[in-house]
Amino acid sequence: FKVATPYSLYVCPEGQNVTLTCRLLGPVDKGHDVTFYKTWYRSSRGEVQTCSEARPIRNLTAADLHLHHGGHQAANTSHDLAQRHGLESASDHHGNFSITMRNLTLLDSGLYCCLVVEIRHHHSEHRVHGAMELQVQTGKDAPSNCVVYPSSSQDSENIT
């Protein structure tokens, strides 16, 4: 399986909400002894391996933000803890999973990573991640709504 990031760059005005998205692609083993663990964390550029550095998102670790279930079941994080920090991660039955960040500030700018761990009990963990950048802007040059740039090209889309 692979993880796709529909958008590689999100440019948002301060105070706006944004939903960062990843998609699980390819055949997914739904066997009894296969589980998928999905989560989000911040990272930084300039590493040998993108997303190898794991930093909290608004003081919440990847463990705090994880989604747990088997196969393509829907799931979401512990609401209380995440929502107190203006965060919510969720997934659907089609392999899409996301993190929503509310009331963005300039401090939210940076590289974000989604991580999928395919747990094959008795064998190993298989990790796949996706990366995307969030730029939060303020002032007259800031867009009125979030603008997203698809991973395949630099054509932008406006989202409200």
Epitope: H32, D33, T35, Y37, Q49, S52, E53, A54, A62, A63, H66, H68, G70, S78, L115, V117, I119, H121, H122, H123, S124, E125, R127
Partner: antibody, heavy 117, light 107 residues
């Protein structure tokens, strides 16, 4: 804040079954791996096995024939059973939370189990 | 199973000195390696995961590096509370295994 607490008899006779329980408080047991690790006196750490919240288990091959780990989500507890014990099984037994693709981030304080007649 | 060999077995240093601990794997573990600290009578405490990511609440004087088969835990300036036994642990596959430990003692 998640906390783990081991409980069970501190003395087990040779050939009998060692039984320990770990109680998870301050958080949900319905996620992560829940592991048992042991440490013989003056020695290093040995991973015994885990139970995933879904019920899937995975054991160290060196102990697999003697180990059973189970979970009771309604009580927020998981348990270890180690059969046919010998003096070599004397150790401090720890329960721990293991985060997928991460590490053992929360440990119980450990409980000493002595195998002796 | 993957064997982790830690060296030295004992490291005798003074407070304020730099400690460099080594962990070598019998085969590549990528960067899937953790470090723990254990003090007498206590459970191990997670310091570093994925070779260099500091766990929550761990002071910046602890840092990890390496990938493949060779890893290093560095304590930049030893504090009195840092004298303990340190273990490495791999998680690239099961069974999860630990190194034999390095004891950092006061010189």
């Amino acid at each position: 804040q998640v906390q783990l607490q081991e409980s069970g008899p501190g003395l087990v006779k040779p050939s009998e079954t060692l039984s320990l329980t770990c109680t998870v408080s301050g958080g949900s047991i319905s996620s992560y791996y829940w592991s048992w690790i042991r440490q013989p006196p003056g020695k290093g750490l040995e991973w015994i096995g885990y139970i995933y919240y879904s019920g899937s288990t995975n054991y160290n091959p060196s102990l697999k024939s003697r180990v059973t780990i189970s979970v009771d989500t309604s009580k927020s507890q998981f348990s270890l059973k180690l059969s046919s014990v010998t003096a070599a099984d004397t150790a401090v037994y720890y329960c721990a939370r293991d985060i997928p693709a991460s590490a053992f981030d929360i440990w119980g304080q450990g409980t000493m189990v002595i195998v002796s007649s | 199973e993957i064997v982790l060999t830690q060296s030295p077995a004992t490291l005798s240093l003074s407070p304020g000195e730099r400690a460099t601990l080594s962990c070598r794997a019998s085969q590549s573990v990528s960067y899937y390696l953790a470090w723990y600290q254990q003090k007498p009578g206590q459970a191990p405490r997670l310091l570093i995961y994925d070779a260099f990511n500091r766990a929550t609440g761990i002071p910046a004087r602890f840092s990890g590096s390496g990938s493949g088969t060779d890893f290093t835990l560095t304590i930049s300036s030893l504090e009195p509370e840092d004298f303990a036994v340190y273990y490495c642990q791999q998680r690239i596959n099961w069974p999860l295994t630990f190194g034999g430990g390095t004891k950092v003692e006061i010189k």
